[in-house]
């Protein structure tokens, strides 16, 4: 466009500015050692210091460590950004009893309402389940489904909240890392090789290009490039592709330049706790109890429901093999998630019924 030419020429004559063809504007050239906070900076305040991956620039202009969510009772709520820390919260089915800066020092399982009580408010990451007396005349066995609400994030029933975080954690600080390697991997959704540059389960700033760095002058290809095993997310950040290296996972789709790898539970297992592009917890395919039959649904996004088999039919389940292994499943990533409103428990042969919820996806 001819009208852009004079502006471009003026721009080139000014050493503190450059012309960005992509936005057809004159942009402020950040001084050496500072990086732009937007594609076309206009003034010095649009330039900032750069921090290493997994560090953010705090108000005092210091690079500060983002909190880590790799303790097995925590999940990432918001990622580590250039100007703000990662935020962690208790994983689904748990609530925070002792808060910490950008995280939680102690998580407890949500309480399950005792007999004669029903859920008034389901538990959240911040609050425990609130129970209230059941309506008069309704038995603990629940006469009607409306009057008998299960906790929306039911877990192994607990008489009172049960802590799982290390006792050494303190409210004033970020929790220390704990738990087994497998638990860390399951909870944080991503794994890393011992010498991998990725952060466990979290988007990281590309150690190369600044996420907000403008295209090189005169460059036609403005797409930011990411390291191997990273993809370019919608926010223009290089984000770690999930890892399927846990032994109960297999790769479903590969890591591409603009999308993460996706993982699914290996054959013979189904997903009990879903995770972004993966599964946080795979369990052996359930052995149906007599008089129940699985009603398959679409993979990990929907709840599996259980219903009585039609008269005259056998349950659609394989008998338990003698070696105790679960039979191979035709839908390996089918989610083992129970409809939280239907007051059902899974027919898994355990001493106590296990209620699993889909609310914490």
């Amino acid at each position: 466009f001819p009208q852009d030419r004079p502006f471009e020429d003026t721009c080139h004559g000014n050493p503190s500015h450059y012309y960005d063809k992509a936005v057809r504007r004159c942009c402020y050239r950040c001084p050496m050692g500072l990086f732009p906070t937007q594609q076309c900076p206009q003034r010095p305040t649009d330039c900032r210091k750069q921090c290493e991956p997994d560090y953010y620039l705090d108000e005092a202009d210091r690079c500060t460590a983002c909190v880590t969510c790799s303790r097995d009772d925590l999940v990432e709520k918001t990622p580590c950004a250039w100007n703000s820390s990662r935020v962690c919260e208790c994983r689904p089915g748990m609530f925070c009893s002792t808060s910490a800066v950008n995280s939680c020092a102690r998580c407890f399982f949500h309480s399950v309402c005792p007999a004669g009580m029903i859920v008034k408010f389901p538990g959240t990451a911040q609050k425990n389940t609130v129970c209230e007396p059941a309506s008069p005349g309704v038995s603990p066995a629940c006469a009607s489904p409306e009057n008998c609400k299960e906790p929306s994030s039911g877990t192994i029933p607990q008489a009172k909240p049960t802590p799982v975080s290390p006792a050494t954690s303190s409210a004033s600080t970020m929790p220390v890392r704990g738990g087994t390697r497998l638990a860390q991997e399951a909870a944080s959704k991503l794994t890393r090789a011992p010498d991998s540059p990725s952060s466990v389960g979290r988007p990281s700033s590309d150690p190369g290009l600044s996420p907000t760095q403008p295209c090189p002058e005169g460059s036609g290809d403005c797409r930011k490039q990411c390291e191997p095993d990273y993809y370019l997310d919608e926010a223009g950040r290089c984000t770690a592709c999930v890892s399927c290296s846990r032994d109960d996972l297999v790769e479903k789709t590969p890591c591409a330049w603009n999308s993460s790898r996706t993982c699914e539970c290996r054959p013979g297992m189904i997903c009990a706790t879903s995770a972004t592009n993966s599964c946080a917890r795979c369990v052996p395919y359930p052995i149906c109890a007599a008089e129940t039959v699985t009603k398959p649904q679409d993979m990990a996004e929907k709840d599996t429901t259980f219903e009585a088999p039609p008269l005259g039919t056998q349950p659609d389940c394989n008998p338990t093999p003698e070696n105790g292994e679960a039979p191979a499943s035709t839908s390996p990533t089918q989610s083992l998630l129970v409809d939280s409103q239907a007051s059902k428990t899974l027919p898994i042969p355990t001493s106590a019924p296990v209620a699993l919820s889909s609310t914490g996806k």
């Epitope: 290493e52 991956p53 952060s199």
Partner: antibody
Framework: QVQLQQSGAELAKPGASVKMSCKAS????????MHWVKQRPGQGLEWIGY????????DYNEKFKDKATLTADKSSSTAYMQLSSLTSEDSAVYYC?????????????WGQGTLVSVSA | DIVMTQSHKFMSTSVGDRVTITCKAS??????VAWYQQKPGHSPKLLIY???TRHTGVPDRFTGSGSGTDYTLTISSVQVEDLALYYC?????????FGSGTKLEIK
Amino acid sequence: QVQLQQSGAELAKPGASVKMSCKASGYTFTTYWMHWVKQRPGQGLEWIGYINPSTGYTDYNEKFKDKATLTADKSSSTAYMQLSSLTSEDSAVYYCVRRGSYDGNPFAYWGQGTLVSVSA
Amino acid sequence: DIVMTQSHKFMSTSVGDRVTITCKASQDVSTAVAWYQQKPGHSPKLLIYWASTRHTGVPDRFTGSGSGTDYTLTISSVQVEDLALYYCQQHYSTPFTFGSGTKLEIK
């Protein structure tokens, strides 16, 4: 395996400059920022600053801003630190250091150190 | 800058003893504390980070703990090869700073 090989000892006169090197191997050089740490004889450790080898971006501890200059050569996977206007206070062992990973894992890999002796 | 204080310059111990080295930060460092071991003529070696996470290959007799401003490194049963200098470091924010060191000696 990850290795950081530093250049040999330097003997310099007050007011002079020295430039030491740190050759990285066993990983992709541009993936990790290179840190530098100073240790005076019989004393503690001081963080000097770091460089992003991919972009040349540097950040320094205020104390070393006018003393150290960090550079990196991608083609040879080598990081450099130049110390200027040397005084006896600069006599120390200087380490190049790399993180173990980017999940907050700090200085897992250290070079063997370069001893700088400043003497008239 | 965050100051890391190791109050004991020296600590005397015997082989098999349990020893605890302390470190205090001048402000809350949110458990972003690492511990290093250094032997004469060698580079420092990472032992612990995020206050309690043992680095790969570090024997389990080394444990770290603490929160807020107070951190400790404990060696449950001191071995001869553990006699060295121990430094704490905050990897919380720039400039990263180290303690002055604690030297573990045999009684």
